[in-house]
């Protein structure tokens, strides 16, 4: 046994952890055969020359969440076996040139959550084996050309949460092995053509929460392996027709929180692997035919919180695998009876917070697997006869906050609700708006014998109970499905983020199943 500093804990002598505010300098003596050293939550403010000189076998060094603001250039001398170095969550403003010299085995370098103002090509010129470089959460305003030129093996680079206002088109040109590039939460207004051309192995590109207004038409044309592209919360007002044409591997695309006004047919695709498309919080006013027709595998399409007032009957052509469609909080007044006809696998549809006055009787005709329909807060006075007849899996139907007209024509809907209540959850009950004598009364307990006759033909056909199960017992009252936890945005699955915020904000999703991808 080679001894362990009193302020540290050593497990099997090769793993050392030193924590606590009483520590103000690197503890000594450290076991010479230590392979992992963690110095966390201390009051160390500086690293002097060679504090780790006698532990040359060290493979992983974490110096995190300290008061560290100054490092001597030779602080990491003699650590030739070091593969993982984290200086994250300190107070570093400047990195001395040559700090990482001699770290020939270094593969992961974490400098995130400091106060770094700049980086220079000389900082990383010796780190030829580096695979992961984390620089997010600093104060970087620009990246000089050549900063990463020697990092030819780099696979993951995170520059998010800095103050970058522009990117040189040459800065990433030598990073042919890069798989993940994160530039989220900066101040980028545009990205020059060619910036990503050298990134032929890129799988994830995170550009969300910048101020990008325009995308160059060929910006992603060399990124054939891209799987995840995050463009949300920018200022993008239009998409060049060919911008997404060369992304056959893409399976996640987020465009929510932009200023998109229209989507041209064929803009998305071909993207045979795209599973989710997030377009909420834009200014889209209409959806033309075939706008999503290349997205054959799409399962989640979020179009809520736009200004959509018109959907062409063929807008959803090709979406045969779609499971979730969110159209809530738009300006829809009418829907064509065939608009959802192609969505044979649709399970959840949210249409709440629109201006729908009526629905065609065949609106859900081919969507036999629907489990949840949200129609609350529209202008519906009644629903067509038999609209839900065939929906044997329906177990959540929200109809409240509509101006239901409770004359005798409402009886079929009222009966359908009553006979199917064990399958429809326990949500807020629909309430009559007219005529005046029943205003405010629950639609399902109005006195049918004083219901005002309608002005239409007296013989009213009715909703059969759905589904008819002559040979099975009725549903138990546990059939009400699914959590209504909803995400405000897709979880962008960053392993280097310490926390991922998920909220219960129903205003965005309007869905019954939270999708985290």
């Amino acid at each position: 046994y080679h001894g362990c500093p009193s302020e540290c804990t050593c497990s099997r002598a090769s793993q050392v952890e030193c924590t606590g505010a009483r520590i103000v300098a690197v503890p000594t003596p450290l076991p010479w055969n230590a392979m992992s050293l963690q110095i966390l939550n201390t009051h160390i403010t500086e690293l002097n020359e060679s504090p780790f000189l006698n532990i040359s076998a060290l493979i992983a060094l974490r110096i995190e969440k300290n008061e560290l603001s100054r490092i001597t250039p030779g602080a990491f001398r003699n650590l030739g076996s070091l593969r993982y170095l984290s200086l994250a969550n300190n107070k570093l403003q400047v990195l001395p040139i040559g700090l990482f010299q001699g770290l020939d085995s270094l593969e992961s370098l974490l400098l995130s959550s400091n106060q770094l103002l700049q980086i220079q090509p000389a900082h990383f010129s010796q780190c030829s084996n580096l695979k992961e470089l984390q620089l997010h959460g600093n104060h970087l305003e620009y990246i000089p050309d050549g900063a990463f030129d020697h990092l030819v093996g780099l696979t993951k680079l995170n520059l998010g949460k800095n103050s970058l206002t522009h990117i040189s088109p040459r800065v990433f040109q030598h990073l042919g092995n890069l798989q993940v590039l994160r530039l989220y939460e900066n101040r980028l207004t545009d990205i020059p053509m060619g910036t990503f051309d050298g990134l032929v192995n890129l799988q994830e590109l995170a550009l969300q929460q910048n101020q990008i207004g325009l995308l160059s038409p060929g910006l992603f044309h060399n990124n054939h392996n891209l799987q995840r592209l995050y463009l949300s919360n920018n200022h993008i007002s239009q998409l060049p027709p060919s911008v997404f044409m060369q992304l056959p591997q893409l399976n996640r695309l987020t465009l929510f929180g932009n200023s998109l006004k229209e989507l041209s047919p064929g803009i998305f695709g071909p993207m045979p692997n795209l599973r989710e498309l997030w377009l909420y919080d834009n200014h889209i006013s209409s959806l033309p035919d075939n706008v999503f027709s290349n997205l054959r595998q799409l399962q989640v399409l979020i179009l809520s919180r736009n200004q959509i007032s018109f959907i062409s009957p063929g807008a959803f052509n090709g979406l045969t695998e779609l499971r979730e469609l969110s159209l809530h909080t738009n300006a829809l007044q009418d829907l064509d009876g065939n608009v959802f006809r192609m969505l044979a696998n649709l399970q959840n549809i949210s249409l709440q917070n629109n201006r729908l006055r009526q629905l065609p009787g065949n609106i859900f005709a081919n969507v036999n697997g629907l489990m949840a329909i949200q129609l609350q807060n529209n202008q519906l006075e009644n629903l067509p006869l038999g609209i839900f007849d065939h929906l044997g899996k329906l177990c959540e139907l929200r109809l409240y906050d509509n101006p239901w007209r409770c004359d005798s024509d409402i009886l079929p809907l009222r009966n359908w609700l009553l006979l199917n209540q064990p399958r429809l959850g326990t949500d807020t009950v629909p309430v009559c708006f007219s005529p005046a004598n029943v205003r405010g009364q629950s639609l399902i307990i109005i006195n049918v014998n004083v219901a005002v006759p309608s002005v239409h033909v007296p013989e009213v056909p009715s909703y059969p109970e759905t589904p008819w199960y002559p040979d099975t017992p009725s549903y138990p009252d546990t059939t009400s499905v699914s959590s209504t936890t909803e995400l405000t945005s897709p979880v962008e699955d960053y392993t280097d983020l310490t926390t991922i915020q998920v909220t219960d904000d129903r205003s965005v999703w309007g869905m019954t199943q939270a999708q985290s991808g």
């Epitope: 009966n415 013989e459 009715s462 109970e465 008819w468 009252d477």
Partner: antibody, heavy 113, light 111 residues
């Protein structure tokens, strides 16, 4: 006014079937559920089934023995109970609407050998 | 099945006095915030008559002295001032789920 008029009393032997009718008038026939309920002599009420727009739901206790049908042209609902046994002796009522707001006068079915 | 238990089995009340009948369900009969509990009156030789639906709503033509209350599993039918014509058997019934089930009945007589 709303009326439900049922067919007359029946006497049946065990194992036989009985078909009771319920003719509705005074309202839009297709807009309401029709239930069947029975009451054995001196006993309480037991729900059998309902029919609505040709769809039916049955009490499990009667499944396989009871069949409900309707004829919209005559606004009539029929309830047929098969494989009769003595304990099926009861007054059989039809009733309208989900909340059973109007009832027929009842049909006494006696099962006796 | 939901089991409905009525109490008392019989009740003798003076004319003009209040009569109270209780009904307990073996599980909640609430949905949408509404209690699917109904009350019926049956006089000898007659079919039942709807008095109260959805716990507290009066059926058509039912005198105001009949009222219903309760939620969840416990419900009450109250006749505020018993009249001679109120002598009958009273049944509670749940219509929350199939099979719709009735209580055993409470016979109300004049003391």
């Amino acid at each position: 006014q709303v009326q439900l008029v049922q067919s007359g009393a029946e006497v049946k032997k065990p194992g036989a079937s009985v078909k009771v009718s319920c003719k509705a008038s005074g309202y839009t026939f297709t807009s309401f559920v029709i239930h069947w309920v029975r009451q054995a002599p001196g006993q309480g009420l037991e729900w059998i089934s309902y029919i609505y727009n040709d769809g039916t739901k049955y009490n499990e206790r009667f499944r396989g023995r009871v069949t409900m049908t309707r004829d919209t042209s005559t606004s009539t609902v029929y309830m047929e109970l098969s494989s009769l046994r003595s304990e099926d002796t009861a007054v059989y009522y039809c009733a309208r609407d989900y909340y059973f707001d109007y009832w027929g006068q009842g049909t006494l079915v006696t099962v006796s050998s | 099945d939901i089991v409905m238990t009525q109490s008392p089995d019989s009740l003798a009340v003076s004319l003009g006095e209040r009569a109270t009948i209780n009904c307990r369900a073996s599980e909640s009969v609430d949905y949408y915030g509404i209690s699917f509990m109904n009350w019926y009156q049956q006089k000898p030789g007659q079919p039942p008559k709807l008095l109260i639906y959805a716990a507290s709503n009066q059926g058509s033509g039912v005198p105001d002295r009949f009222s219903g209350s309760g939620s969840g599993t416990d419900f009450t039918l109250t006749i505020s001032s018993l009249q001679a014509e109120d002598v009958a058997v009273y049944y509670c019934q749940q219509s929350k789920e199939v099979p719709y089930t009735f209580g055993g009945g409470t016979k109300v007589e004049i003391k």
